[in-house]
Interface confidence: low
């Protein structure tokens, strides 16, 4: 056996776990399920930005943000099919080591540029619905774009070490050419702190945040509906916010978990090839659940507001836009017709979606 | 551990065939599988390999003439020799290779004692 000088429990795990991962179900379910996504993604995303930035022409906080998480999950959709071949072939990457480098870190830069953009959209819905009147100033189309900015700024931060540490290369004898993260057994520290970072800073930290928010908000809208006991009740809204914080816990957490079981594998806590099969047969299949799901977010977001889905439903009929910009309404993004924090005078009415994009 | 043993090597005229095959003590089904070749005073070469599925690849010295095949069931990888010329005059090596699709890519891989294929012209 080459390389097997280290005693460390990481290189262990290579040595006696030769199946992990390699099954023959693997190498066409997955560039299968990575076309869908695609296919999917390419089309649903490429229309959220049209309606957003043409249709809707880009007047809300929301949809600034939205527009980002399109536009995000547009860059990653890109490289899939990259990645597709890459499964198909076994994984041997036949694209050079620029590809390498830009679709790994492209997939990094999506995780983590769609959780923040996704977290400050829960804190701008919250300030929203909560604080209408204290956060309006606050919740200007400018603080929405340099926020959206510093997001792009600290995702791209976060996939530098995919730029700089994933790379192409030909491993000896065989004819096999990889792009991953190459590294000494002994320097460990590298993947660790990448799959503890993605699971602390790229999900536990948003999702609680998350959590946070739509409790928030989910507090606020029953104290106004218990204000408001004669009118009735309605109910869409809390399935909405019920739907927004499970649809981002359960999309994400499988592939958190087994990332989290990976990094145990790497620290040789976990020494079981069973388990080692299962994380690595397992880690194809979360990415897909994870970013499908996550290409899916502009339209679930989207379609809960009633001129997004006009808009998409119109563009679908090739109805092109107004030359007209639409009139600018001064509440903008946070409009509702019932706003718990307002005074209880304005409560008459019954309280309206409170996720429209604009 | 895997061990593998060559056999159906020998002397050929040129232009014949041959057909060599590597037995393993154990499962292959999770291996990639290759054949090298070492002429003598020049370095080991590969020669053709098949992956977990069916992907194969060859050296562009022995493309078309060469077919490798695997025999998950037997545990057996076959190389199918045709035309064969001379310059395969080496001994032909199988071994079985393998390493993580994740971030740690640890190389390594199990060699057999090798079968000497001898082609005269």
């Known amino acids: 056996i080459l390389n097997s000088s280290t005693e460390d429990g990481i290189k262990r795990i290579q040595d006696d776990c030769p199946k992990a991962g390699r099954h023959n179900y693997i190498f066409v379910m997955i560039p299968t399920l990575y076309s869908i996504i695609f296919v999917v993604g390419i089309f649903g995303n490429s229309l959220v930005v049209i309606v957003i930035y043409f249709y809707m022409k880009l007047k809300t906080v929301a949809s600034v943000f939205l527009l980002n998480l399109a536009l995000a999950d547009l860059c990653f959709l890109l490289t899939l099919p990259l990645w597709a071949v890459y499964t198909a072939m076994e994984y041997r990457w036949p694209f050079g080591n620029y590809l390498c480098k830009i679709a790994s870190a492209s997939v990094s830069f999506n995780l983590y540029a769609s959780v923040f953009l996704l977290t400050c959209l829960s804190i701008d819905r919250y300030l929203a619905i909560v604080h209408p009147m204290k956060s309006r100033l606050r919740r200007t189309m400018l603080v929405a774009k340099v926020t959206c900015i510093i997001i792009w700024l600290l995702a791209g931060l976060a996939s530098l070490p995919a730029i700089i540490h994933r790379n192409v290369f030909f491993i000896e004898n065989t004819n096999i050419t990889v792009c991953a993260f190459h590294y000494e057994s002994q320097n460990s520290t590298l993947p660790i702190g990448l799959g503890l970072t993605k699971n602390i800073l790229g999900f536990l930290f948003p999702f609680l945040i998350i959590l946070t928010s739509y409790t928030l908000i989910w507090k606020a809208l029953k104290k106004a509906y218990e204000i408001q006991k004669n009118k009735p009740r309605n109910d869409d809204i809390f399935k909405i916010i019920m739907a927004i914080v499970l649809f981002f816990f359960f999309s994400w957490i499988p592939h958190q978990i087994f990332t989290f079981l990976d990094v145990l594998i790497q620290l040789g806590i976990i020494r079981d090839c069973r388990i080692a099969d299962i994380v690595d047969t397992a880690m194809p299949i979360t990415i897909c659940i994870a970013y499908f799901n996550n290409c899916l977010n502009p339209l679930f977001y989207g379609f809960l507001g009633k001129k997004f889905k006009r808009y998409f439903l119109q563009l679908l009929k090739y109805i092109p836009p107004k030359a007209k910009s639409h009139s600018n309404l001064s509440t903008k993004m946070s409009t509702l017709s019932y706003r718990p924090s307002d005074n209880v005078s304005s409560s008459t009415k019954k309280p309206a979606p409170c996720f429209e994009v604009e | 551990q895997v061990q593998l043993q060559e056999s159906g090597g020998g002397l050929v005229q040129a232009g014949g065939s041959l057909r060599l095959s590597c037995a393993a003590s154990?499962?292959?089904?999770?291996?990639?599988m290759g054949w090298y070749r070492q002429a003598p005073g020049k370095e080991r070469e590969f020669v053709a390999g098949?992956?977990?599925?069916?992907?194969?690849n060859y050296a562009d010295s022995v493309k078309g003439r060469f077919t490798i095949s695997r025999d998950n069931a037997k545990n057996t990888v076959y190389l199918q020799m045709n035309s064969l010329k001379p310059e395969d005059t080496a001994v032909y090596y199988c071994?079985?290779?393998?390493?993580?699709?994740?971030?740690?890519?640890?190389?390594?891989?199990?060699w057999g004692q090798g079968t000497q294929v001898t082609v005269s012209s």
């Open positions: 071994a079985a290779y393998n390493y993580f699709p994740r971030s740690i890519v640890y190389y390594y891989v199990y």
């Open positions: 154990g499962s292959i089904s999770y291996y990639r």
């Open positions: 098949i992956g977990v599925g069916t992907t194969t």
